[in-house]
């Protein structure tokens, strides 16, 4: 039992705070924001993690065509409502009263509405589109090496099981990666598309959520895989709920 | 290397209340637990409570509330266990240990005798 | 409160014999198990926790398995100095809760 086992720390999230207080010295993490228990064996919700990032101080053609139903996060950061799981609440409220209903990654899929506004289900987001534009390269990457390296990260880094990436597409300079995972198809256990696509998007901007991990270093075939623009496409399993003059605008 | 001290044995009238210590040396006496168990003669092992002196938040078992208290020094690296209105079960040798992810350094033992 | 039904409550054994305890949770308890070994007069030992870590200076011989809510110690060849208690202990939640021990003698 040596000192380095010694360390109560949450690898899998930097927002929290740890001690060694839990059952027989259980080392137990709580999200900062929240106040909520993590499992550090896993990653932490989005919702959570969201929550935290709120709380901290601030500082400083192969390709697949979005759905129309497709969303993007355009409304960026807020304070999120979270369940006892650490899941988001359907629906979302600012201070000033305005409410709105979100889908299972936390993105505003109804026009936004007063206390009265109802959002009767957590809506799942079943499909993501991660785009990706890498900066300029000597050549193209191989396109079955840059395949196994994202389905390897995805894996390994994120614990993603390999059957949600359901395809990586490359037209150099774009690449794009397709998460699926149905609720039928979700076990126990399993980590959800949209935590680990927030995980990837974190990372790619050199934000990492990782305790003492170095930032992400891709590399396909030792060629640095450098991104240069990310574009998440959000796909629920029930069309959002949008009035015509935001469709048209 | 990590040791707990234990004070020594106890003999006390039925009624009355004893205070026991567990010195630690050896590592940082806040970053860890410090558990209390119980062994009856002939029997088994219990457990007492807990107490991580790095916060001063504690846990009891709920058959020793009003029965056990558990303080901690950190200024003197001691945790102690107050026992109240003894009875001859309370008999029983006393053992402190530092736990840390179920792993535990055990003290050498503090034995409590209630007789009248 | 989570009970821990620990088997046998006694037993001999040979020396060099394979030597199994078990313990048995009345819920899952996600691997949070330790093993104790407690000898007359002396302090309890850690031999494993989390199910199955051996503690850094524990002879080899002694491997912990398990998960949910079944768990054994197993001694794979049995040695003068084994005799004595064995305790399991659960840490999933508060309070803890030992087995009610296995009294290991040599036959």
């Known amino acids: 039992h040596t000192a380095a086992q010694d360390n109560c720390t949450c690898p899998t999230n930097k927002m929290t705070v740890c001690s060694p207080d839990g059952p027989g010295g259980r080392c137990q993490c709580r999200a900062l924001g929240s106040g909520m228990a993590v499992d550090c064996s896993t990653l932490t919700s989005k919702c959570l993690l969201l929550k935290a990032r709120m709380s901290a101080p601030k500082n400083a053609r192969t390709l697949v065509r979005p759905s129309e139903h497709a969303l993007v996060d355009n409304d960026g950061l807020y304070d999120p409502d979270c369940d006892p799981e650490g899941r988001f609440k359907a629906r979302q409220c600012n201070q000033t009263s305005v409410c709105w209903c979100v889908n299972s990654v936390g993105v505003r899929r109804t026009d936004k509405g007063d206390l009265s506004l109802r959002c009767d289900e957590l809506v799942r987001t079943h499909h993501i589109l991660i785009d990706l534009r890498h900066r300029p390269t000597a050549g193209a990457f191989n396109h079955s090496d840059l395949d196994a390296e994202l389905r390897r990260l995805f894996r390994e880094r994120y614990r993603l099981h390999p059957k949600f990436v359901a395809a990586v597409h490359y037209e150099q300079p774009t690449i794009q990666i397709e998460l699926r995972q149905n609720t039928s198809q979700k076990a126990a256990g399993d980590v959800d598309i949209g935590d680990a696509a927030y995980y990837f998007e974190r990372d790619i901007k050199g934000e990492s959520l990782f305790q003492g991990r170095g930032g992400l270093d891709l590399r396909v075939r030792g060629e640095p895989l450098q991104v240069e623009r990310t574009l998440i496409y959000y796909l629920d399993e029930i069309p959002p709920k949008f009035s015509m003059k935001r469709l048209t605008a | 290397q990590v040791q707990l001290q234990q004070s020594g044995p106890e003999v006390v009238k039925p009624g009355a209340s004893v205070k026991m210590s567990c010195k630690a040396s050896?590592?940082?006496?806040?970053?860890?637990?410090i558990n209390w168990v119980k062994q009856r003669s002939g029997q088994g092992l219990e457990w007492i409570g807990q107490?991580?002196?790095?916060?001063?938040?504690?846990h009891y078992n709920k058959n020793f509330k009003g029965k056990a208290t558990l303080t901690a020094d950190k200024s003197s690296n001691t945790a102690y266990m107050q026992l109240n209105s003894l009875t001859s079960e309370d008999s029983a040798v006393y053992f402190c240990?530092?736990?840390?992810?179920?792993?535990?350094?055990w003290g050498q033992g503090t034995l409590v005798t209630v007789s009248a | 409160d989570i009970k821990m039904t620990q088997s046998p409550s006694s037993m001999y054994a040979f020396l060099g014999e394979r030597v199994t305890i078990t313990c048995k949770a009345s819920?899952?308890?996600?691997?949070?198990l330790s093993w104790f070994h407690l000898k007359p007069g002396k302090s309890p030992k850690s031999l494993i926790y989390?199910?199955?870590r051996l503690v850094d200076g524990v002879p080899s011989r002694f491997s912990g398995s398990g998960s949910g809510q079944d768990y054994s110690l197993t001694i794979s060849s049995l040695d003068y100095e084994d005799v004595g208690i064995y305790y399991c202990?659960?840490?999933?939640?508060?309070?803890?809760?030992f087995g009610g021990g296995t009294k290991l003698e040599l036959k």
């Open positions: 240990a530092r736990f840390f992810e179920g792993f535990a350094y």
């Open positions: 989390r199910a199955n």
């Open positions: 050896g590592y940082r006496f806040t970053d860890y637990v």
């Open positions: 202990l659960q840490y999933d939640e508060f309070p803890l809760t």
């Open positions: 819920q899952g308890i996600n691997n949070y």
């Open positions: 107490i991580y002196p790095g916060s001063d938040t504690f």
